[in-house]
């Protein structure tokens, strides 16, 4: 009886089960009653990452430097090229098809998490006792200066954007 279902890594064609081509190879011709499935390795800059019956291999992804992309991992016959972004940039999507400049944290906000090639800068508002007076993609919120430890007193209170201003203590007259 002709099969209605085939084993893993096989496919049904013309009432018979044929072996799929292994990753890194494409289908040249289906099996027959006399021959096995004929497969050929993918060419340079091509890949197939699954057991398959594809007649064409996929092209490796191109990491376009004009889009801020560079190669993170070179593709093989079984894997696609993995792109990442140049320093200071991050991917706009999981597929990393283009890059955007890392966001900077405005004054009053500090960097909670520095950006990577795949994620943007995460900012957080500076809490009481901390400040940031610059727009930066790296600077965290800094603690206000402790006037007391310097034997000084606060002359001007700090904000989320400015440090405290310390001054000498008033002398008793």
């Amino acid at each position: 009886e002709p099969p209605t279902a085939c084993r893993e890594k096989q496919y049904l064609i013309n009432s018979q089960c044929c072996s799929l081509c292994q990753p890194g190879q494409k289908l040249v011709s289906d099996c027959t009653e006399f021959t096995e499935t004929e497969c050929l390795p993918c060419g340079e800059s091509e890949f197939l990452d699954t057991w398959n019956r594809e007649t064409h291999c996929h092209q490796h992804k191109y990491c376009d430097p004009n889009l801020g992309l560079r190669v993170q991992q070179k593709g093989t016959s079984e894997t696609d090229t993995i792109c990442t972004c140049e320093e200071g940039w991050h991917c706009t999507s999981e597929a990393c098809e283009s890059c955007v400049l890392h966001r900077s944290c405005s004054p009053g906000f500090g960097v909670k998490q520095i950006a990577t090639g795949v994620s943007d800068t995460i900012c957080e508002p500076c809490p009481v006792g901390f400040f940031s007076n610059v727009s930066s993609a790296f600077e965290k919120c800094h603690p206000w200066t402790s006037c007391e430890t310097k034997d000084l007193v606060v002359q001007q209170a700090g904000t989320n954007k400015t440090d405290v201003v310390c001054g000498p203590q008033d002398r008793l007259r």
Epitope: V28, S29, C31, T32, E33, F34, T35, E36, E38
Partner: antibody, heavy 117, light 107 residues
Framework: EVQLVESGGGVVQPGRSLRLSCAAS????????MSWVRQAPGKGLEWVAS????????YYPDNVKGRCTISRDNSKNTLYLQMNSLRAEDTAVYYC??????????WGQGTLVTVSS | EIVLTQSPATLSLSPGERATLSCRAS??????LHWYQQKPGQAPRLLIY???QSISGIPARFSGSGSGTDFTLTISSLEPEDFAVYYC?????????FGQGTKVEIK
């Protein structure tokens, strides 16, 4: 018991035709692909033709394509090989074989074809 | 066309000895190779299929190995009835091709 019995061989002049037959028994003939393989005197094995179980698909090497035709009659459990424009180099024992698991799992005893003037 | 080259052409051994026959393919054929035995005046018979799979009714002293381009048929201990010609055959792609054969003869 699987049996393959070839017939139709003999002496034939160059340029003439010959039809070989293979009578199959002991298995469901219509479920199996079949092939012809030949062996020139004192030489190795050479594949000549194959036909799918239903008879829809046929396969030949380049050196016999156009001169040989493989066919089958599933109602008669018989395989055929029609050979035309015979040459001296076609002289050989012709074996009928069954395709089981993509192997030639059963062979007939062979029939000798001699092409000579 | 895939060319199969068998070596040696002739192997002269004594009963009880181990026989190692080689078959090399001109390109990778994965494990798509069969081995056949032919005794004088007889039709060939299938010994090993898919390079290493044993056939029911074939003595366990016959074994096959290899994948890609290099294949081996081993007869662990030769019996008098094993002296014959051995052929490899590929079924990876059309046309089906055989090796030229290795004759195992009594020394």
């Amino acid at each position: 018991e699987v049996q393959l019995v070839e017939s139709g061989g003999g002496v034939v002049q160059p340029g003439r035709s010959l039809r070989l037959s293979c009578a199959a028994s002991g298995f469901t003939f219509s479920n199996y692909g079949m092939s012809w393989v030949r062996q020139a005197p004192g030489k190795g094995l050479e594949w000549v033709a194959s036909i799918s179980s239903g008879g829809d698909d046929t396969y030949y090497p380049d050196n016999v394509k156009g001169r040989c035709t493989i066919s089958r009659d599933n109602s008669k459990n018989t395989l055929y090989l029609q050979m035309n424009s015979l040459r001296a180099e076609d002289t050989a024992v012709y074996y009928c074989t069954r395709a089981g698991g993509k192997a030639m799992d059963y062979w007939g005893q062979g029939t000798l074809v001699t092409v000579s003037s | 066309e895939i060319v199969l080259t068998q070596s040696p052409a002739t192997l002269s051994l004594s009963p009880g000895e181990r026989a190692t026959l080689s078959c090399r393919a001109s390109q990778s054929i994965r494990d798509n190779l069969h081995w056949y035995q032919q005794k004088p005046g007889q039709a060939p018979r299938l010994l090993i299929y898919y390079a290493s799979q044993s056939i029911s009714g074939i003595p366990a002293r016959f074994s096959g190995s290899g994948s890609g381009t290099d294949f081996t048929l081993t007869i662990s201990s030769l019996e008098p009835e094993d002296f014959a010609v051995y052929y490899c055959q590929q079924f990876n792609s059309w046309p089906l091709t055989f090796g030229q054969g290795t004759k195992v003869e009594i020394k």
